[in-house]
């Protein structure tokens, strides 16, 4: 029962984590304009992995996609790759783990096969979570580097009385979503790996002992009953609830206004 619970919980946690990774990847707020040095700006800039946006105080938001592939920084490409790999691995892991769930019966699938599938999906979730955490961390590091570089150059280009304040970017909401989601996927993967140990048929070192009764010769093998009858398995169709992670990229600050590209 504890194994089923651990496996089921691992699946749900990973599902939420992967939904979060997808949400973070799609979000536009990976980096947002730092307003510390310019709190009176009427124009707010923010950037995602796929496009950059400008929200005016009038409520209008303009987003422009990065239509170049070669012109983008290598780090951004690397972050994109890490996030996509994380999503793909996570999606495959989810697919595998559905069939590995102890509460779902598929033909006469052996427990050993389910254990292997659970381990496979667990490893996939762990790698998926690590990819997401790595991707978000690389982007965060890039932001920190650029932040301090632009701080150092803050007032270069000051000519006479004219001030040119350089736009600095700080951590956006997507980074925190990505870190949390990656962590959840990682935890879910670890739970699946733990569940795998409990699912695997226990091979004992005891030799099969023959008991001779009068007129009958029956051999009992330890663990045989459990293996043959499917004892302890949950045969009910257990519903997995997906909370439905929603992406709040806030491309638009006012619902009644239209975005234009």
């Amino acid at each position: 029962m504890a194994v089923t619970a651990c496996q089921g919980l691992g699946f749900v946690v990973s599902l939420i984590g992967i939904a979060g990774i997808i949400a973070a990847t799609c979000m536009d707020q990976w980096s947002t304009q730092d307003l510390y040095n310019n709190p009176v700006t009427a124009v707010f800039n923010y950037q995602g992995l796929w496009r950059s946006c400008v929200r005016e105080s009038s409520g209008f938001t303009e987003c422009r996609g990065y239509f170049t592939l070669l012109g983008l920084p290598a780090m951004l490409q690397a972050v994109r790759a890490l996030m996509i790999v994380g999503i793909v691995l996570g999606a495959i892991g989810l697919l595998v783990s559905i069939f590995a769930l102890k509460c779902i019966r598929i033909g006469s699938m052996e427990d050993s096969a389910k254990a292997n599938m659970t381990l496979t999906s667990g490893i996939m979730f762990i790698v998926s979570g690590l990819c997401a955490i790595a991707g978000v961390s690389v982007f965060a590091n890039m932001l920190v580097t650029n932040f301090w570089m632009s701080t150092a150059n803050m007032y270069t280009g000051m000519g006479g009385m004219v001030q040119t304040v350089q736009t600095r970017y700080t951590f956006g909401a997507a980074l925190f979503v990505g870190w949390v989601a990656g962590g959840l996927t990682l935890i879910g993967g670890v739970m699946m790996c733990i569940a795998c140990r409990g699912l695997a048929p226990e091979e004992t070192n005891y030799k099969a002992v023959s008991y001779h009764a009068s007129g009958h010769s029956v051999a009992y093998k330890p663990g045989g009953f459990k293996a043959s009858t499917g004892f302890g398995s949950n045969t009910k169709n257990k519903k997995i609830y997906d909370g439905g992670a929603r992406t709040e990229d806030e491309v638009q600050s006012y619902p009644s206004k239209h975005d234009y590209v």
Partner: antibody, heavy 118, light 113 residues
Framework: EFQLQQSGPELEKPGASVRISCKTS????????MNWVKQSNGESLEWIGY????????RYNQKFKGKATLTVDKSSSTAYMQLKSLTSEDSAVYYC???????????WGQGTTLTVSS | DIVMTQSPSSLTVTAGEKVTMSCKSS????????????LTWYQQKPGQPPKLLIY???TRESGVPDRFTGSGSGTDFTLTISSVQAEDLAVYYC?????????FGSGTKLEIK
């Protein structure tokens, strides 16, 4: 057609308060910020502040904080500006204007003349 | 606050002439995020409210005659009327739309001979 219809001219005594209205029609009132602008005796323009009719959020020019209060009535698609503790300095033409792309003001009311005199 | 300085304060021209007026801001109005300048030009005729002519420094508002052209970037901006008409008699204001509080220039009064 878009319209911003402002209330008529006002004559007030110093120290009094006044409320100017700006009734809109022809567009989604909650979809656009409403700005208020002051023009003293045909001189230059001064931005007072704006209100977001959807959320009710406001942003004021520091100079007019405590002097002007911006409100809206969504049901009648009307924006209001209340001016308190009036002095002769407040005598001016006040305009309401709708926010547009680039934070520009695309539609303006006809203006409300406020005269503060004892 | 960003200070907007307009010049000349007034100018008198004959119909058909080309006119340019200047607007300078104390800070750059260029937004790096979309490479747009948050400067607006308005026309105010006597006894009327201001009318939007140009936003984003160079984008002409719909219905505005193409003789009106906005140009410039950063801190220096220009409004050009290629061939002045009698109906262009007005005061022209530039406005900072980049930083709070939104500030207006003192205006350029255009008079026709």
């Amino acid at each position: 057609e878009f319209q911003l219809q402002q209330s008529g001219p006002e004559l007030e005594k110093p120290g009094a308060s006044v409320r100017i209205s700006c009734k809109t029609s022809g567009y989604s009132f909650t979809g656009y910020n409403m700005n208020w602008v002051k023009q003293s005796n045909g001189e230059s323009l001064e931005w007072i502040g704006y209100i977001d009719p959807y959320y009710g959020g406001t942003r004021y020019n520091q100079k007019f904080k405590g002097k002007a209060t911006l409100t809206v009535d969504k049901s009648s698609s009307t924006a209001y500006m209340q001016l308190k503790s009036l002095t002769s300095e407040d005598s001016a033409v006040y305009y309401c204007a709708r926010s547009y792309y680039g934070n520009a003001f695309d539609y303006w009311g006809q203006g409300t003349t406020l005269t503060v005199s004892s | 606050d960003i200070v907007m300085t307009q010049s000349p304060s007034s100018l008198t021209v004959t119909a058909g002439e080309k006119v340019t007026m200047s607007c300078k801001s104390s800070q750059s109005l260029l937004n790096s995020g979309n490479q747009k300048n948050y400067l607006t030009w308005y026309q105010q005729k006597p006894g009327q409210p201001p009318k939007l002519l140009i936003y984003w420094a160079s984008t002409r508002e719909s219905g505005v005659p193409d003789r009106f052209t906005g140009s410039g970037s950063g801190t220096d901006f220009t409004l050009t009327i290629s061939s002045v008409q009698a109906e262009d008699l007005a005061v022209y204001y530039c406005q900072n739309d980049y930083s709070y509080p939104f500030t207006f220039g003192s205006g350029t009064k255009l008079e026709i001979k």
